[in-house]
Interface confidence: low
């Protein structure tokens, strides 16, 4: 494979903790300024597997606020607007990276953490288990 | 609001770049070891708004591999297994944090970046615009 040469302008990495501990610039390069999912689209309401968005806040985490989707129904909404239990509303989950303050309450020291969040819901055909 | 006292064991923060630059431990605390979304569930295939998962790789980003969902159809799959264009398959998007190597190719210096990824698809009732 291609080896990319190390940039000579990199910060010094001779710290005894390297490469576990790295420097991170928190000035976020943000390509999307709309962080409230309720404003970004109304899919959560128009979906055949609609969901509610719950605010999850944790001051020891960055980002401190994460929105979690909870499916409104076990079934899906059919053409008549009724819940059809022959289909299932299920959460679509995504693994995301967050920063966890470590040691706790430190303003400038973090540890990477992977958490699983539900982003929205989709309508699926149920798996039917036939009893022999 | 409540002011949490600073932990006396925090690293020194008298760097001229503070608080923009912080120390991050890359030893991930991972509550979920399954990072391939195709293995985590087969919803992408069973959904009425099925999607394909595309591998997006960037060695200058951490994580370097991100899976992007692309809806297979404009419409949704109906009970007969056909695409119904009276409904729309739409991507559910999520803003996630990634680390971008900065300066480029540096092994131990990053900048936080927010990117929008499509996690999966859901079936929605279209917004119908009636022409006057």
């Amino acid at each position: 494979g291609i080896t990319i040469p190390r940039n000579p302008g990199c910060p010094n990495s001779e710290d005894k903790n390297f490469p576990r501990t790295v420097m991170v610039n928190l000035n976020i390069h943000n390509r999307n300024t709309n962080t409230n999912p309720k404003r970004s689209s109304d899919y959560y309401n128009r979906s055949t597997s609609p969901w509610n968005l719950h605010r999850n806040e944790d001051p020891e985490r960055y980002p401190s606020v994460i929105w979690e989707a909870k499916c409104r129904h076990l079934g899906c909404i059919n053409a008549d607007g009724n819940v059809d239990y022959h289909m299932n509303s299920v959460p679509i989950q995504q693994e995301i990276l967050v920063l966890r303050r470590e040691p706790p309450h430190c303003p400038n020291s973090f540890r990477l953490e992977k958490i699983l969040v539900s982003v929205g819901c989709t309508c699926v055909t149920p798996i039917v288990h036939h009893v022999a | 609001g409540i002011t949490i006292p600073r932990n006396p064991g925090c690293p020194n923060s008298e760097d001229k770049n503070f608080p923009r630059t912080v120390m991050v431990n890359l030893n991930i605390h991972n509550r979920n070891t399954n990072t391939n979304p195709k293995r985590s569930s087969d919803y992408y295939n069973r959904s009425t708004s099925p999607w394909n998962l595309h591998r997006n790789e960037d060695p200058e980003r951490y994580p370097s591999v991100i899976w992007e969902a692309k809806c297979r159809h404009l419409g949704c799959i109906n009970a007969d297994g056909n695409v119904d264009y009276h409904m729309n398959s739409v991507p559910i998007q999520q803003e996630i944090l990634v680390l971008r190597r900065e300066p480029p190719h540096c092994p131990n210096s990053f900048r936080l970046e927010k990117i929008l990824v499509s996690v999966g698809c859901t079936c929605v009732t279209p917004i119908v615009h009636h022409v006057a």
Epitope: R31, N32 | C71, L116, I127
Partner: antibody
Framework: EVQLLESGGGLVQPGGSLRLSCAAS????????MSWVRQAPGKGLEWVSA????????YYADSVKGRFTISRDNSKNTLYLQMNSLRAEDTAVYYC???????????WGQGTMVTVSS | NFMLTQPHSVSESPGKTVTISCTRS????????VQWYQQRPGSAPTIVIF?????PSGVPDRFSGSIDSSSNSASLTISRLKTEDEADYYC?????????FGGGTKLTVL
């Protein structure tokens, strides 16, 4: 009725800059990804750039990467294309288009002409 | 990146049927939708087929689209040709980061 009206075209010297705008009406602008497509005189269509409904994701053709920037202001129902370091080969009619989904331009504006010449 | 190849021109008489082909150079055509756009002289393009074979409302059923996975190609068929069908036709497809148009086919209705 979906309406897309491009503006901002004109004559510019090589190396110069221009900002195109596309005013949208007749639909919920923030719900749709948008694209710019261009057509050089007597030539075929060439995709230039695309942006997601929220503005969070942007995509560019290799031929314009690093020189052009697509953006949108959903509060003004307006799509933009900032074009820097313009070259003679950027001369074309620039169309803005509303995407049905990624890669499907459902509705088009009438276009605005950009001429890069000394 | 991939390319979409179309014939430069085709011609046919009114009332007849004409087919325009579009071949994808790399990557499975079946994995991504193919669209067809009509562009009359001096006008902006309009979509006549999306999602391989779907017609937007207002497009006559004389227009149809299909794909052939074995040859990695798509086709636009126009039956019962009319003089107003004379135009340039562009196929278009995409992958996860690029949108590509074919070079265009000039249809002449004799």
């Amino acid at each position: 009725e979906v309406q897309l009206l491009e503006s901002g075209g004109g004559l510019v010297q090589p190396g110069g800059s221009l900002r195109l705008s596309c005013a949208a009406s007749g639909f919920t602008f923030s719900s749709y990804a948008m694209s710019w497509v261009r057509q050089a005189p007597g030539k075929g269509l060439e995709w230039v750039s695309a942006i997601s409904g929220s503005g969070g994701s942007t995509y560019y053709a290799d031929s314009v990467k690093g020189r052009f920037t697509i953006s949108r202001d959903n509060s003004k129902n307006t799509l933009y294309l900032q074009m820097n370091s313009l070259r003679a080969e950027d001369t074309a009619v620039y169309y803005c288009a509303r995407d049905l989904i990624w890669g499907v331009a459902g509705s088009w504006g009438q276009g605005t002409m950009v001429t890069v010449s000394s | 990146n991939f390319m979409l190849t179309q014939p430069h021109s085709v011609s046919e008489s009114p009332g007849k049927t004409v087919t325009i082909s579009c071949t994808r150079s790399s990557g499975s055509l079946a994995n991504y939708y193919v669209q067809w756009y009509q562009q009359r002289p001096g006008s902006a393009p309009t979509i006549v087929i999306f999602a391989n074979n779907q017609r937007p409302s207002g497009v006559p059923d004389r227009f149809s689209g299909s794909i052939d996975s074995s040859s990695n190609s798509a086709s636009l068929t126009i039956s019962r040709l009319k003089t107003e069908d004379e135009a340039d036709y562009y196929c278009q497809s995409y992958n996860h980061k690029d949108i590509v148009f074919g070079g265009g086919t000039k249809l002449t209705v004799l």
